[in-house]
């Protein structure tokens, strides 16, 4: 059991420790996973290669605020979202929307988080005199992973349960904050 993945009202993905964040729905490609129509076999495509290192995936920069209950981070954090499709590095455009995007005839590789970084953020709560502190785990890089017939849709989903929204009530006035932490710009500590 790991720390949960929260999704706030703006559907921003808030990954926490021990979780693998999921790309936002608009970035998902539902043709990237093995399905029955492929008989569980990786399809042939013109750029067949055995070396995963020859494949690249798109790392989309994603800026968002971290939320926790009624609180929100004082500053936005920037992380990567791993695009759902992988392809030969030489065919990937440098920017989204430029060039022709290579699309294999079936599922073969999946772009997934590779490395994470933890970042301490100051949380501001409505009416609060001082912020709280929380650490979030952010995607630092992505990698292509070859899928086998044993991979299924659930394998790359979040491991945590989606948290219920906290009950609406009076806003917190958190005062629990280290004076030392207040003096530091902790958002950039990592």
């Amino acid at each position: 059991q790991g720390w949960q993945a929260f999704k706030n009202d703006a559907t921003e993905i808030i990954p926490e420790l021990g979780e693998y964040p999921e790309p936002p729905p608009e970035l998902e490609n539902n043709k990237t996973m093995n399905r029955a129509e492929n008989g569980g076999r990786p399809p042939h495509h013109p750029f067949e290669t055995k070396d995963v290192s020859e494949y690249s995936c798109r790392e989309l920069h994603f800026t968002r605020y971290v939320t926790d209950g009624p609180c929100r981070s004082a500053k936005p954090v920037t992380e990567l979202v791993c695009s759902g499709q992988c392809g030969p590095a030489r065919l990937l455009p440098n920017a989204i929307g430029r060039g022709k995007w290579w699309r294999p005839s079936g599922p073969d590789f999946r772009c997934i988080p590779d490395r994470y970084r933890a970042q301490r953020v100051q949380l501001l709560c409505p009416g609060g005199e001082a912020p709280r502190a929380r650490k979030v785990r952010l995607v630092a890089s992505c990698k292509c992973k070859r899928l086998t017939r044993f991979h299924n849709q659930s394998e790359l989903k979040d491991f945590g349960t989606e948290a219920a929204r906290p009950q609406k009530g009076r806003k917190p006035r958190p005062r629990a904050r280290s004076a030392k932490a207040n003096q530091a710009e902790l958002e950039n500590a990592y």
């Epitope: 709280r132 906290p166 958190p174 629990a176």
Partner: antibody
Framework: QVQLVQSGAEVKKPGASVKVSCKVS????????QHWVRQAPGKGLEWMGW????????EYASKFQGRVTMTEDTSTDTAYMELSSLRSEDTAVYYC???????????WGQGTTVTVSS | DIQMTQSPSSLSASVGDRVTITCRAS??????LAWYQQKPGKAPKLLIY???TLWSGVPSRFSGSGSGTDFTLTISSLQPEDFATYYC?????????FGGGTKVEIK
Amino acid sequence: QVQLVQSGAEVKKPGASVKVSCKVSGFPIKDTFQHWVRQAPGKGLEWMGWSDPEIGDTEYASKFQGRVTMTEDTSTDTAYMELSSLRSEDTAVYYCATGDTTYKFDFWGQGTTVTVSS
Amino acid sequence: DIQMTQSPSSLSASVGDRVTITCRASQDISTALAWYQQKPGKAPKLLIYWASTLWSGVPSRFSGSGSGTDFTLTISSLQPEDFATYYCQQGDTLPYTFGGGTKVEIK
């Protein structure tokens, strides 16, 4: 699988110090906040303080200020809590806890019994 | 320090019963409240935080409500593994403080 494994029971004399360790596995300790909570025999829970292993930031309950020191070794993912000038009322089970925030305790160690007796 | 008062201090119930435990803070803590379950000889386990948000892996029969100074933990249908002591904890103001606990025993 997140796990916190604490050091074994200790028996100390009044005035002595005790240092309890807490080995964290499942994620790097620097990615967390470490808390220490104690529970006297048959009593409730008492928060002692938290620390941020990444930057060495600490916040102690005023009751323990000057007597408690919380440190971490990020290379071994181990947290330590040292309590000095022990007295009989410090006899308790000491728990380490960890989490992603400074204000709740997500995962707990099994506890370390510290007995202070002359 | 904020005082957290739980009631009752103990209660007897049967499997299948609906159980309600209350926690009162000595001052407004908004929704900065967590609930923990502790079994004899074991460490506490987080059940609920932000007064009403269920922690990962906790059965849905547990629920929390309240804000300000009055909070409730409800177990909709008590199971054999739920017999334990329950603590509330405020996370609004340092030092964080716990309630005295409510022991749920088998009737």
